[in-house]
Interface confidence: low
Amino acid sequence: MATLEKLMKAFESLKSFQQQQQQQQQQQQQQQQQQQQQPPPPPPPPPPPQLPQPPPQAQPLLPQPQPPPPPPPPPPGPAVAEEPLHRPKKELSATKKDRVNHCLTICENIVAQSVRNSPEFQKLLGIAMELFLLCSDDAESDVRMVADECLNKVIKALMDSNLPRLQLELYKEIKKNGAPRSLRAALWRFAELAHLVRPQKCRPYLVNLLPCLTRTSKRPEESVQETLAAAVPKIMASFGNFANDNEIKVLLKAFIANLKSSSPTIRRTAAGSAVSICQHSRRTQYFYSWLLNVLLGLLV
């Protein structure tokens, strides 16, 4: 079977499985709610609104071929750092081996020269990245682990030739604000690649990322906040210089709100993020003073 054909087949199988898995999860959640006869929990957050267009001086991030519409993100997991997510395994584990194999097939073929020469390559790479990020939240830990390794391999192999596309796909996952594991997988990788964004793209990325980071800061999961706090210094070191005073204040306010959290982890990560936002702004001293005044105001 030709490389491209193998790739498409793996794409289709994996995509349909992941959609089916998400539907099953939603059904199971609904059944559990009905069985418990309790008032239903708040619905999952709606897909994030379309980001505002960058201001005139900023360019769009990249021309985007239309990927298939992503399935709706599952609701965020519990606000617990340690407890793993429990999901019923019936019917899903039957194809665990297939999912691992599909990930490996995609991983192997997306870096193959024959696929890289294809006029469809940018689109295929986008789908591959989306699927690996989806699989980062698979119910089976070994599928998650393989997906994680695949993301690392693909990024390493294609960094020289396709860095802007890789950055864009990771950004799109952050923007999606979906499952905690997928979000974390995208966040830390985007942060690692942020310093490689071309200077003319830094302002557009900053403008588009600000609402995402603000939204992520509102997530209840401690694990997400940990990853966000590790990512913010790297993202701000790359883009902080391109932010105006108002944008810095909006971001700071989001983290200041977390200082009132009942979770010590969320309070600590918020404090670290706020400090690094000031540190990497254009007016470091001004924002340190501004932050200090706001904090003193909270104490009064």
Epitope: S141, V146, A147, R184, E192, S223, A230, T265, R268
Partner: antibody
Framework: QVQLQESGPGLVKPSQTLSLTCTVS??????????WSWIRQPAGKRLEWIGR???????NYNPSLESRVTISLDTSNNQFSLKLTSLTAADTAVYYC???????????????WGQGTLVTVSS | DIQMTQSPSSLSASVGDRVTITCRAS??????LNWYRQKPGKAPQLVIY???SLQSEVPSRFSGSGSGPEFTLTISSLQPEDFATYYC?????????FGQGTKLEIK
């Protein structure tokens, strides 16, 4: 290839403080992907988890050692370290540094280990 | 803390034998159970993670099963390099805890 290497004194006096460093190659200790851990093993006994650190300086310690332990990161040298205070003979063990594997931070195995360093507490 | 108990504590077997080691957790840990092999003077090496997933480069004669409180590690046909001490470890929560070990010796 990820490699971890422990370094520090082989002999420490009782009541003193043990300082060990783990130097990492092939991975970045500042990456939001991993937890960096310390484990020890007294001769002929089971492995004992000491604690772990995350790049945001978040730490988890074994409650049995918490009052005496500090684990920290040195991102500029790509290292992480262990400090254990008020040593007694019971702290004599082989000390290992390790990395929790990526993919599922909430329940990850220790996929990479250093070769271990023997620490003897004796006057 | 979650207590991990392995049985047997030691086991004598011959090359080619099939052996099974059991690990029991003091509370529910789902499938967050890892197995390590340790040879004298060496660091532990991951063999099985998440109860049943084989770590890359570990031979397929190793397999793991179980969920909840009870887990097993099986070696289908012992090879000379398999004689070592095996530890189970829960990664369900912190503090991470290990079993006391099962020493596998040549009969």
């Amino acid at each position: 290839q990820v490699q971890l290497q422990e370094s520090g004194p082989g002999l420490v006096k009782p009541s003193q403080t043990l300082s060990l460093t783990c130097t990492v190659s092939g991975a970045s200790v500042s990456s939001g992907a991993y937890y960096w851990s310390w484990i020890r093993q007294p001769a002929g006994k089971r492995l004992e988890w000491i604690g772990r650190v995350y790049p945001t300086w978040s730490t988890n310690y074994n409650p049995s050692l918490e009052s005496r332990v500090t684990i920290s990161l040195d991102t500029s040298n790509n290292q992480f370290s262990l400090k254990l205070t008020s040593l007694t003979a019971a702290d004599t063990a082989v000390y290992y540094c390790a990395r929790e594997a990526p993919g599922d931070y909430d329940a990850a195995p220790l996929a990479y280990w250093g070769q271990g360093t023997l620490v003897t507490v004796s006057s | 803390d979650i207590q991990m108990t392995q049985s047997p504590s030691s086991l004598s077997a011959s090359v080619g034998d099939r052996v099974t080691i059991t690990c029991r957790a003091s509370q529910y840990i789902s499938h967050y159970l890892n197995w390590y092999r340790q040879k004298p003077g060496k660091a532990p090496q991951l063999v099985i993670y998440a109860a049943s997933s084989l770590q890359s480069e570990v031979p397929s004669r190793f397999s793991g099963s179980g969920s909840g409180p009870e887990f097993t590690l099986t070696i289908s046909s012992l090879q000379p390099e398999d004689f070592a001490t095996y530890y189970c470890q829960q990664s369900y929560t912190t503090p991470r805890t290990f079993g006391q070990g099962t020493k596998l010796e040549i009969k």
